[in-house]
């Protein structure tokens, strides 16, 4: 008898089964149909809760969740100060917008990353066209 | 409407024999295996056998070898004969489909694995 | 012959909640595992096959993951619609050239 499987019907390194009466496809993950021809989509139906946004990867999806939420569809409230947001000692504030970050003396930016200097100048990164350093970043 | 209705069941005495039948409608019976799958009062669903319509294949559970027969009928129906019948027996029998796929230029028919039709189910109780 | 468990066998849970139900099958099965629901009185209904592709009109808060071995099916925003027994399967291919299919013993679930 030919041996069906030796043409390699299976996609995606499925493997082949001849059944005898059919052949049978066991896919790898992340791929299905009757030859593993589908590549799944892993974020298809897959909502994430509150603003967070599916990731694909590895045949499961995971969800990036908003600031403040967590667990695997983002319907968990989390802390957002839990991380430690803020650089050099500043202060985390929980904030329903997010968090706020009141920075240590000597200290400045949005999460307290930039050094003050102490002629009054900050040491931002240059800002893009249209944007002062000192103005809140976006 | 797709649909699979089974009949012939009801109460039967040890020792006896029974044919149940299933009778499809609503979708073309070839590139599917139908199959009849048991289930005991509060217990899960058992395989016993499948027969696949192209070319009239059958194939059942090793433990459903030499009572449980199933045959092709006609070109919208199977049935499932049972032979030496036990109380072991009683359960509500199940007709399913299992769909198979065929492609333009491929070697054979692939299965699916899975049941994505199912009938309500015909009760047998084996009782004297 | 491949061996399908379920676990747990029962499980409770509130409207709004999530349930995760496990089936470990006894090879390796690849992504070849489907997820049916039943109601009493009811044959059981095909939720999603190849571990994750849900049936058409099954709504999204069904969610099967899993590969190989060890698979899921997760059910969240419970509703007292999902209170049914649910039963993985899958097929197997032995050596000795027969081929067949095998159910989890299921689990049940109760929406309170």
């Known amino acids: 008898r030919v041996d069906r499987c030796s043409l390699q019907p299976c996609r995606n390194g499925g493997l082949c089964l001849d059944l005898g009466h059919a052949l049978r496809c066991r896919c790898r993950a992340g791929f299905a149909g009757p030859r593993c021809e589908h590549d799944l989509d892993d974020c298809a139906g897959r909502a994430c809760a509150n603003g967070g946004t599916c990731v694909e990867g590895g045949g499961a999806h995971r969800c990036s969740c908003a600031l403040g939420f967590g667990g695997r569809d983002c319907r968990e409230r989390a802390d957002p100060c839990a991380a430690r947001p803020c650089a050099h000692g500043g202060r985390c504030y929980a904030h329903f917008s997010g968090l706020v970050c009141a920075c240590a003396p000597g200290y400045m930016g949005a999460r307290c990353e930039f050094p003050v200097h102490p002629d009054g100048a900050s040491a931002l990164p240059a800002a893009p066209p249209g944007l002062r350093p000192g103005d809140p970043q976006r | 409407q797709e649909q699979l209705v089974e009949s012939g069941g009801g109460l039967v005495q040890p020792g006896a024999s029974l044919t149940l039948t299933c009778k499809a409608s609503g979708f073309d019976f070839t590139s599917n295996a139908m199959c009849w799958v048991r289930q005991a009062p509060g217990k899960g669903p058992e395989w016993i056998a499948c027969?696949?319509?192209?070319?009239?294949?059958a194939y059942s559970a090793s433990w459903a070898k030499g009572r449980f027969t199933v045959s092709k009928t006609s070109s919208t129906a199977v049935t499932l004969q049972v032979t030496g019948l036990t109380a072991a027996d009683t359960a509500t029998y199940f007709c399913a489909r299992s769909p198979y796929y065929t492609y333009g230029g491929a070697p054979s028919a692939y299965a699916s694995g899975y049941f994505n039709l199912w009938g309500p189910g015909t009760l047998v109780t084996v009782s004297s | 012959d491949i061996v399908m468990t379920q676990t747990p066998a029962s499980v409770e849970a509130a409207v709004g909640g999530t349930v995760t139900i496990k089936c470990q099958a006894s090879e390796n099965i690849y992504n070849s595992l489907a997820w049916y629901q039943q109601k009493p009185g009811q044959p059981p209904k095909l939720l999603m096959h190849?571990?994750?592709v849900l049936t058409s009109g099954v709504p999204s808060r069904f969610s099967g993951s899993g590969y190989g071995t060890e698979f899921t099916l997760t059910i969240s925003d419970l509703e007292c619609a999902d209170a049914a027994t649910y039963y993985c399967?899958?097929?197997?291919?032995?050596?000795?050239?027969?081929?067949?299919?095998?159910f989890g013993g299921g689990t049940e679930v109760v929406v309170k």
């Open positions: 190849d571990a994750s």
């Open positions: 027969i696949y319509n192209d070319d009239g294949s």
């Open positions: 399967q899958s097929d197997y291919y032995s050596t000795g050239g027969s081929y067949g299919f095998a």
